[in-house]
Interface confidence: low
C-alpha cells in the first residue's frame, strides 16, 4: 500500500522536511503533489511525467519544493504556513489512480527566556513572590527549576497561567535559592539565566557566647553576640538595663564582683524593622583563701585513737574534697566524712594511716589544695626479732645477737640472760663463749610513748657436740601430683654441714628434688606415692656428727581405676554372685555398688545368692577418697543364662 512518511514530523521554522514515499507502484505514467488532504487542481504543488521526465509546477508551488524520481518531495526553508497535510496522486500506466496522504507540523525556534519578579526583597513570613517566565509563546510548555532541581512539593508553591507563573507564598529564608525557568516545544528547549531570591529575615533571638556565666575576679570579660539576620543585624549591649555600646562584642578587662549582673544583647534589622534581645546573668566571684587542715590529735595511738581532720576555713555552699596518698578517698568503714565533707574522721588509726592527707575547696573555676599533712601514728612495739637465728654455737666463738621491733617512736631495748638484766642496748655481744654461756636469752622492747612492752626468748646452746637433729615438715599429708613438701633439718647451727638420706641412700638426682637454705631444707615438688619413704637428715662439723630419726612421708593418692574380680561376666542361673572391688588408694577408699544405675550397698564385696536372668545388667563399683577428694569407677556387664543352655558358663562361687 502506498504510504507517505514525513521526516521529521515536527519541523522547526527555516529547516527542511522530506515527504518520503513508500511502496511506489511500478509502471507509472506520472504523479502529482497537492497541499491538503485531497486532490485539488487549485492546490497542486508540482506534477511529474515519467516518460518525459518533466516536472510541472502548480498553483501552490512556492519555489522551495524539489521532487525526486522516486516521487519523494523535499520542502526547504520551512515557514509556519507549511504546517498540514500533503497528498500524492499517482497515475499508473493502466491509468488507474492511487492516492496517499502525509502530514507534518511546523514550530518556531524558541528564544532564551527570562524571569520577571513582582518583589525583589520579600520579607520572611510576610510577603509572597510571583516569578513570571518571559516571553509568552504559543504552543510552548513552561518548566521551573530551584537550585537546578525540579520544583519540590509544597503548599507554599503554586503554578498558574499555564505554568508560566510560579508564586511562593509566605516566603522563608530557606526560599533563598537559584530559580530558573525553561520553555519547551517539540523542536527546541531553552533555559533562562538564574534569578537569586533575596529573602529578608530576622533577626532571630541572639546567642551570647561563650556560654559560661561564672568568672573569677581579675579576669577579662569578652562576650560576643550573634543573631541570624538578612541583612546582617546591628548590635547593642546593655548592662543592668543601661546602654553600653553598639558593637557585636563587649569587652571589659580586669572585672570585679561589681561587674556581676544582667547583660543584654539587642539585635536590630533595619530592613525588616525587627528587634530581638537575649539576656545572660554574669556572676563574678572573689578568690577563695587557700585551705589548710587541722587535726584533733597529732599523735594518735594505733588501734586505740580516732583522728578527726578538718578542712579550714568553713565556707558556705562550697564543695570540700579529700585525698589520701595522692589518691581519692578509698572506701573503708574506718573512714567517715561529715555531711558537708569538711571533716574526715579516721576510726581506730593504724600505722598505715600516716598519709599524706590533702583537702581541697572547689570554687567555681578551680580546686584549691591545702598543703599535705602527715599523721604521726604511735604504734608497737611488735614482737621483737632476734638475729641471727642460730641456736647452737661452738665454744670459743663470739656471740653477737641483734634485736629489732617495729615501733613508733623507736623502741628501747633490754637484754636478759636466764632472767637477769644484762644491758640496755639493741645489740648483745659476748666474746669467746663457753658452755657456761648456754641459757635463755631474752630481748625486751619498750615504747615509751604508748607504755607498751614486748619480749622474745631464744635458747642458746654452747657445745662442742652437735645435738641430735630432727625433721620438721610443712605438709604432713601431701596429695599426689598436687602438693609439694618442704623438710627442714632442725636446729640451725653455725658452721654446720647438712646432709640427707632417703631409705638409707644418699639423695637421688631428680628435677623434683631441690636443696636450699644451705642444704638445710629439702623440697619435693609434685609428690608421688613413690615418695612415701623414710627421710633422715644429718648435721656435722669438724668435731661431731649426728643423724635424725627417720620421718616417713605419708603421700595421699588415688583412688586408681578399680578392678572387679573375678573377671567372669557369664553365669548360670542359680549360682551365687560374689564380686569384689579393689582400688589402690591412700587412705583406703570408700566403696559403693550400683546395679543398672540403682544404688546398692556401701561395701567392698557385693554378694547375691542364687542369681536368675533377672540379675542381668551393668554392675558398677564406685570408689572415693575423702582425703584427696578424688573419685573413680568401673562398670562390668553380667549375663545370667538359664541352667544348661550354654556350655562353659561359670557355676559361680
Amino acid at each position: 500500500k502506498l504510504t507517505i512518511e514525513s521526516t521529521p514530523f515536527n519541523v522547526a521554522e527555516g529547516k527542511e522536511v522530506l515527504l518520503l514515499v513508500h511502496n511506489l507502484p511500478q509502471h507509472l505514467f506520472g504523479y502529482s503533489w497537492y497541499k491538503g488532504e485531497r486532490v485539488d487542481g487549485n492546490r497542486q504543488i508540482i506534477g511529474y511525467v515519467i516518460g518525459t521526465q518533466q516536472a510541472t509546477p502548480g498553483p501552490a508551488y512556492s519555489g522551495r519544493e524539489i521532487i525526486y524520481p522516486n516521487a519523494s518531495l523535499l520542502i526547504q526553508n520551512i515557514i509556519q504556513n507549511d504546517t498540514g497535510f500533503y497528498t500524492l496522486h499517482v497515475i499508473k500506466s493502466d491509468l488507474v489512480n492511487e492516492e496517499a496522504t502525509g502530514q507534518f507540523r511546523v514550530y518556531p525556534e524558541l528564544p532564551k527566556p527570562s524571569i520577571s519578579s513582582n518583589n525583589s526583597k520579600p520579607v520572611e513570613d510576610k510577603d509572597a513572590v510571583a516569578f513570571t517566565c518571559e516571553p509568552e509563546t504559543q504552543d510552548a510548555t513552561y518548566l521551573w527549576w530551584v537550585n537546578n532541581q525540579s520544583l519540590p512539593v509544597s503548599p507554599r508553591l503554586q503554578l498558574s497561567n499555564g505554568n508560566r507563573t510560579l508564586t511562593l507564598f509566605n516566603v522563608t529564608r530557606n526560599d533563598t535559592a537559584s530559580y530558573k525557568c525553561e520553555t519547551q516545544n517539540p523542536v527546541s528547549a531553552r533555559r533562562s539565566d538564574s534569578v537569586i531570591l533575596n529573602v529578608l529575615y530576622g533577626p532571630d533571638a541572639p546567642t551570647i557566647s561563650p556560654l559560661n556565666t561564672s568568672y573569677r575576679s581579675g579576669e577579662n570579660l569578652n562576650l560576643s553576640c550573634h543573631a541570624a539576620s538578612n541583612p546582617p543585624a546591628q548590635y547593642s549591649w546593655f548592662v543592668n538595663g543601661t546602654f553600653q555600646q553598639s558593637t557585636q562584642e563587649l569587652f571589659i578587662p580586669n572585672i570585679t564582683v561589681n561587674n556581676s549582673g544582667s547583660y543584654t544583647c539587642q539585635a536590630h534589622n533595619s530592613d525588616t524593622g525587627l528587634n530581638r534581645t537575649t539576656v545572660t546573668t554574669i556572676t563574678v566571684y572573689a578568690e577563695p583563701p587557700k585551705p589548710f587542715i587541722t587535726s584533733n590529735n597529732s599523735n594518735p595511738v594505733e588501734d586505740e585513737d580516732a583522728v578527726a581532720l578538718t578542712c579550714e576555713p568553713e565556707i558556705q555552699n562550697t564543695t570540700y574534697l579529700w585525698w589520701v596518698n595522692n589518691q581519692s578517698l578509698p572506701v573503708s568503714p574506718r573512714l567517715q566524712l561529715s555531711n558537708d565533707n569538711r571533716t574526715l574522721t579516721l576510726l581506730s588509726v593504724t600505722r598505715n594511716d600516716v598519709g599524706p592527707y590533702e583537702c581541697g575547696i572547689q570554687n567555681e573555676l578551680s580546686v584549691d589544695h591545702s598543703d599535705p599533712v602527715i599523721l604521726n601514728v604511735l604504734y608497737g612495739p611488735d614482737d621483737p626479732t632476734i638475729s641471727p637465728s642460730y641456736t647452737y654455737y661452738r665454744p670459743g666463738v663470739n656471740l653477737s645477737l641483734s634485736c629489732h621491733a617495729a615501733s613508733n617512736p623507736p623502741a628501747q631495748y633490754s637484754w636478759l640472760i636466764d632472767g637477769n638484766i644484762q644491758q640496755h642496748t639493741q645489740e648483745l655481744f659476748i666474746s669467746n663463749i663457753t658452755e657456761k654461756n648456754s641459757g635463755l636469752y631474752t630481748c625486751q622492747a619498750n615504747n615509751s610513748a604508748s607504755g607498751h612492752s614486748r619480749t622474745t626468748v631464744k635458747t642458746i646452746t654452747v657445745s662442742a657436740e652437735l645435738p641430735k637433729p630432727s625433721i620438721s615438715s610443712n605438709n604432713s599429708k601431701p596429695v599426689e601430683d598436687k602438693d609439694a613438701v618442704a623438710f627442714t633439718c632442725e636446729p640451725e647451727a653455725q658452721n654446720t654441714t647438712y646432709l640427707w638420706w632417703v631409705n638409707g641412700q644418699s639423695l637421688p638426682v631428680s628435677p623434683r628434688l631441690q636443696l636450699s637454705n644451705g642444704n638445710r631444707t629439702l623440697t619435693l615438688f609434685n609428690v608421688t606415692r613413690n615418695d612415701a619413704r623414710a627421710y633422715v637428715c644429718g648435721i656435722q662439723n669438724s668435731v661431731s656428727a649426728n643423724r635424725s630419726d627417720p620421718v616417713t612421708l605419708d603421700v595421699l593418692y588415688g583412688p586408681d581405676t578399680p578392678i572387679i574380680s573375678p573377671p567372669d561376666s557369664s553365669y548360670l542361673s542359680g549360682a551365687n554372685l560374689n564380686l569384689s572391688c579393689h582400688s589402690a588408694s591412700n587412705p583406703s577408699p570408700q566403696y559403693s555398688w550400683r546395679i543398672n544405675g540403682i544404688p546398692q550397698q556401701h561395701t567392698q564385696v557385693l554378694f547375691i545368692a542364687k542369681i536368675t536372668p533377672n540379675n542381668n545388667g551393668t554392675y558398677a563399683c564406685f570408689v572415693s577418697n575423702l582425703a584427696t577428694g578424688r573419685n573413680n569407677s568401673i562398670v562390668k556387664s553380667i549375663t545370667v543364662s538359664a541352667s544348661g543352655t550354654s556350655p562353659g558358663l561359670s557355676a559361680g562361687a
Epitope: 556560654l211 559560661n212 556565666t213 564543695t319 574534697l321 595522692n326 572547689q362 570554687n363 573555676l365 589544695h369
Partner: nanobody, 119 residues
Framework: EVQLVESGGGLVQPGGSLRLSCAAS????????IGWVRRAPGKEEELVAA????????RYADSVKGRFTISADTSKNTAYLQMNSLRAEDTAVYYC????????????WGQGTTVTVSS
C-alpha cells in the same frame, strides 16, 4: 584566651562506642574540674560526668554509670569521655565545660559535638 574544643562525635549504631575529646587552652585542667554536659531536644540539660584531674576525682550521672568513663591527660591538657554500650537516648549535643564537681555551675564551654545513636 580560654578555649575548650570538643571532637569525636558522630553517628554510631546502638551498642556501639565513641570516644569524645576535650582539648583545653588558656588554663590548666589539673587546677580545675571538667565535665561533659549533654543537651537533647525536649530534654533537660544533663551533667553526665565530671573529673577533677589533679587526683582523678570522678562522678557520673546514674543514666551513664557503668557505660561511660571520664578521664584526663594533664600532660596534653585534654579530657576524654569513653562512651560504651550507647543507646538511642544518648543522642545529644555533648559539651565540654569547666564545672563545679558537685554540678550546678558551668563556666567555660566548648562549641559542642553531636552524638547520634541510630540503627
Amino acid at each position: 584566651e580560654v578555649q575548650l574544643v570538643e571532637s569525636g562525635g558522630g553517628l554510631v549504631q546502638p551498642g556501639g562506642s565513641l570516644r569524645l575529646s576535650c582539648a583545653a587552652s588558656g588554663f590548666n585542667i589539673k587546677d580545675t574540674c571538667i565535665g561533659w554536659v549533654r543537651r537533647a531536644p525536649g530534654k533537660e540539660e544533663e551533667l553526665v560526668a565530671a573529673i577533677c584531674p589533679y587526683k582523678g576525682y570522678t562522678r557520673y550521672a546514674d543514666s551513664v554509670k557503668g557505660r561511660f568513663t571520664i578521664s584526663a591527660d594533664t600532660s596534653k591538657n585534654t579530657a576524654y569521655l569513653q562512651m560504651n554500650s550507647l543507646r538511642a537516648e544518648d543522642t545529644a549535643v555533648y559539651y565540654c565545660a569547666n564545672v563545679a564537681y558537685s554540678g550546678g555551675h558551668y563556666n567555660y564551654w566548648g562549641q559542642g559535638t553531636t552524638v547520634t545513636v541510630s540503627s
